[in-house]
């Protein structure tokens, strides 16, 4: 595989939004009181100096933590189980592809700095996710809360890959 | 830059139907939920309902429940008010505003300039 | 429905002032609480959010707290241009209900 985070990981991480929307269960009108801050570092998916390792190691972290939250029996009890398959699924192949990607960006020499702290940032992001599931004893409404928050986070995540994917496309046509 | 514009001003009969809209711009229109607020002459906010325009799943205000239909179609953006059979006492100005749903984000950020509605024999 | 009750209904104050809005809710709505603006023939602008965020681009003149079922608005020293009608609206449960408006008049 090349590592030009082609078209079809663009693809699988749209078709993972569209998972998770659809894996709703109750109607989120019912959770307005639930609603939690679990701050998204947003900085880390806004910045114009986007760098090849930073942005494919936020979406390895990003994929990473997203496959360990749904991948639990807590996760198995809350979900239909045939969208959770395809999600694994859909998820264990961007996170083989972005593995692959990684290995070949570190062998190029790009410092271990801007992979490492990503991924630091995004699991304490994660673990704050984790202890409000548990304060609210995993309810239909925290999961449907987390689900929001999951969707928008990956969402601002394929943005920045999106815009690294353009502004390689500028300076392959200048 | 977001943007809510909504439809022109309306002068409707009693008895008459009206649908009005509210189109997004500028942000992803499914990521919002679209809420609608009423205002009668002289008088304060009231909040009629909400609509996900990502599924049209939608919630209403006891008040205004069977009294109006609020819809959406995401392929243009656009979220709709709408009456069977207008009353005088629909005459108001009407309000959309999204709201960020679950997600930590402020309420109502953004209003749509409002849209009057006339209701008279 | 959670009600909610704000005072007073109307006030009138000059330039400079330090002006105090408050609104009770019928019931716990935790932080939950927003503070709009309005001025005539205007949409509504978001002032506050979560009863005590400044939304982006509102002057920091304007300050909200409270929590639970106590909240208050404060504009520390009152411009020309705030003089308009104030809401309060809650957004822990549906029905999203708001206030009954307090009219920020010039002395």
């Known amino acids: 595989l090349g590592c030009d985070l082609p078209q079809n990981h663009g693809l699988l991480s749209r078709n993972t939004l569209v998972l998770l929307h659809q894996m709703r269960r109750i109607s989120p009108f019912l959770c307005l009181k639930d609603r939690r801050d679990f701050r998204f570092p947003q900085e880390m998916v806004k910045g114009s100096q986007l760098q090849k390792a930073h942005v494919m190691s936020v979406l390895h972290e990003m994929l990473q933590q997203i496959f360990s939250l749904f991948h639990t029996e807590r996760s198995s009890a809350a979900w239909n189980m045939t969208l959770l398959d395809q999600l694994h699924t859909g998820l264990h192949q961007q996170l083989q592809h972005l593995e692959t990607c990684l290995l070949q960006v570190v062998g190029e020499g790009e410092s271990a700095g801007a992979i490492s702290s990503p991924a630091l940032t995004l699991r304490r992001y994660f673990q704050g996710i984790r202890v409000y599931l548990k304060e609210k004893k995993y309810s239909d409404c925290a999961w449907e809360v987390v689900r929001m928050e999951i969707m928008k986070s990956l969402f601002l995540s394929t943005n920045m890959q999106e815009r690294l994917r353009s502004k390689d496309r500028d300076l392959g046509s200048s | 830059e977001v943007q809510l514009v909504q439809s022109g001003a309306e002068v409707k009969k009693p008895g008459e139907s009206l649908k009005i809209s509210c189109k997004g711009s500028?942000?992803?229109?499914?990521?919002?939920?679209i809420g609608w607020v009423r205002q009668m002459p002289g008088k304060g906010l009231e909040w009629m309902g909400i609509?996900?325009?990502?599924?049209?799943?939608?919630a209403y205000s006891p008040s205004f429940q069977g009294q109006v239909t609020i819809s959406a179609d995401k392929s243009i953006s656009t979220a709709y008010l709408q009456w069977s059979s207008l009353k005088a006492s629909d005459t108001a100005m009407y309000y959309c505003?999204?709201?960020?749903?679950?997600?930590?984000?402020?309420?109502?950020?953004?209003w749509g300039q409002g849209t009057l509605v006339t209701v008279s024999s | 429905d959670i009600q909610m009750t704000q005072s007073p209904s109307s006030l009138s104050a000059s330039v400079g002032d330090r002006v105090t809005i408050t609104c009770r809710a019928s019931q716990s709505i935790s932080k939950f609480l927003n503070w709009y603006q309005q001025k005539p023939g205007k949409a509504p602008k978001l002032l506050i959010y979560f009863a005590s965020s400044l939304q982006s681009g509102v002057p920091s003149r304007f300050s909200g707290s409270g929590s639970g079922t106590d909240f208050t608005l404060t504009i520390s020293s009152l411009q020309p241009e705030d003089f308009a009608t104030y809401y309060c609206?809650?957004?822990?449960?549906?029905?999203?209900?708001f206030g009954q408006g307090t009219k920020v008049e010039i002395k």
């Open positions: 500028g942000y992803s229109f499914t990521s919002y939920w």
């Open positions: 609206q809650q957004s822990y449960d549906f029905p999203i209900t």
């Open positions: 505003a999204r709201h960020p749903g679950l997600n930590w984000a402020p309420d109502f950020d953004y």
């Open positions: 609509i996900d325009p990502s599924d049209s799943d939608t």
